[in-house]
């Protein structure tokens, strides 16, 4: 025959445990039933009745199976900087995020508890490491014969355009000028269109090392600002 | 522009500690990222990890997380790798790379080829 | 981690020729992707970094494509020099990782 399904509350076996979702109460010393997420403990089970269960209230929340006596608060309303990816429900606690253009500076068990706009890359600097939810931006500056003239947080620095002759060359922050002969293009025509990531903090404040001022040997990029360090190289 | 030149063979035992040395010159340490890629004999190329020296901040891949440790002297523009519990697969050539604004790995070290032996 | 296969593993081009290498990534990797060449006895060197842009002082034989998951290098009119192994990287997410290397010979 079956063994007997016992109903909470009940006396478990010496070195048993209580089933899921049931929980052994030291008082009553019998194993009683859990609430479920949503719901808190009302009354608490005796040796003759089992836990009484009430919905949590509007701003608290239990996200688990539980035997507490009262829901939790549901956190604060999320700041200016931040989204609200997760509403308060019964169920479950807000979630907010940074906003784009802002990063994570201090994390909490779920969401943000201090976002931080991301750091722009000043002219001569492009994004060596682009920003993600939990980290900022990383600015360095252009290589030789290379170079980036915008202030972004997404931009990397670009080939210099190669000029049959050069009238101006160029730098870290400019793209060198040719004469009037036309140059060739170091791609495709047309910028590279990367998606926009999350974006902007203080600039990058320090000196721009000036490459070589000798006639740029590289290739051109159309003019404009750099393409975007699209993506993000995640934590 | 920008040289990156390592520091010499090394042969190390099993469980031995291995440091790297990778001396930038032409420019700053503190305008590159630095990242360490290993490649095995007749391998492909894996990265280990990568130091911001002008912040101190670290990133490694989680193969090597436990076992690497990137340090960076800015007084002297000299990048190092720590790889430590060595076993004979970690016998490779390590190579440090420099990163600058173009987000790419613009320079590369000349290879430290380290063999792991008994 | 993301996973870069490149193909084919190796690749018997004559010179004057044209090459053409692939790379898939496991995942979308946007265009964060860089093609590097490597000798043998020699360092890596970038010859394309944000899937199409060639950097400064790779000739216009060079060109790279792609976006998303498909990546592809293209060298024009093969020159003897240009005979070699070459990785395909994605820096979209962490690990950083590299494709296995396609080596490309004389045929």
């Known amino acids: 025959l079956p063994a007997q399904v016992a109903f909470t509350p009940y006396a478990p076996e010496p070195g048993s445990t209580c089933r899921l979702r049931e929980y052994y109460d030291q008082t009553a010393q019998m194993c009683c039933s859990k609430c479920s997420p949503g719901q808190h403990a009302k009354v608490f089970c005796t040796k003759t009745s089992d836990t009484v269960c009430d919905s949590c209230e509007d701003s608290t929340y239990t996200q688990l199976w539980n035997w507490v006596p009262e829901c939790l608060s549901c956190g604060s309303r999320c700041s200016s900087d931040q989204v609200e990816t997760q509403a308060c429900t019964r169920e479950q606690n807000r979630i907010c995020t940074c906003r784009p253009g802002w990063y994570c500076a201090l994390s909490k068990q779920e969401g943000c508890r201090l976002c931080a706009p991301l750091r722009k890359c000043r002219p001569g600097f492009g994004v060596a490491r682009p920003g993600t939810e939990t980290s900022d931006v990383v600015c360095k500056p252009c290589a030789p014969g290379t170079f980036s003239n915008t202030t972004s947080s997404t931009d990397i620095c670009r080939p210099h355009q190669i000029c049959n002759v050069v009238a101006i060359p160029g730098n870290a922050s400019m793209d060198a000028v040719c004469t009037s002969t036309s140059p060739t293009r170091s791609m495709a025509p047309g910028a590279v269109h990367l998606p926009q990531p999350v974006s902007t903090r203080s600039q990058h404040t320090q000196p721009t090392p000036e490459p070589s001022t000798a006639p740029s040997t590289s290739f051109l990029l159309p003019m404009g600002p750099s393409p975007p360090a699209e993506g993000s190289t995640g934590d | 522009e920008v040289q990156l030149v390592q520091s010499g063979a090394e042969v190390k035992k099993p469980g031995a500690t291995v440091k790297i040395s990778c001396k930038v010159s032409g420019y700053s340490i503190t305008d590159y990222l630095l990242h360490w890629v290993q490649q095995a004999p007749g391998k492909g190329l894996e990265w280990m990890g990568w130091i911001d020296p002008e912040e101190g901040k670290t990133k490694y891949g989680q193969k090597f997380q436990s076992r690497v440790t990137i340090t960076a002297d800015t007084s002297t523009d000299t990048a190092y790798m720590e790889l430590s519990s060595l076993r004979s697969e970690d016998t490779a050539v390590y190579y440090c790379?420099?990163?600058?604004?173009?987000?790419?790995?613009?320079?590369w070290g000349q290879g430290t080829l380290v063999t792991v032996s008994s | 981690d993301i996973v870069m296969t490149q193909s084919p593993a190796t690749l018997s081009v004559s010179p004057g020729e044209r090459a053409t290498l692939s790379c898939k990534a496991s995942q979308n990797v946007g265009s964060n992707v860089d093609w590097y060449q490597q000798k043998p006895g020699q360092s890596p060197r970038v010859l394309i970094y944000k899937a199409s842009i060639r950097y400064t002082g790779i000739p216009a034989r060079f060109s790279g494509s792609g976006s998303g998951t498909e990546f592809t290098l293209t060298i024009s009119i093969l020159q003897s020099e240009d005979f070699a192994v070459y990785f395909c990287m994605q820096s979209k997410s962490y690990p950083i990782t590299f494709g296995q290397g396609t080596k490309l010979e004389i045929k």
């Open positions: 790379a420099a990163q600058s604004g173009t987000g790419t790995m613009d320079a």
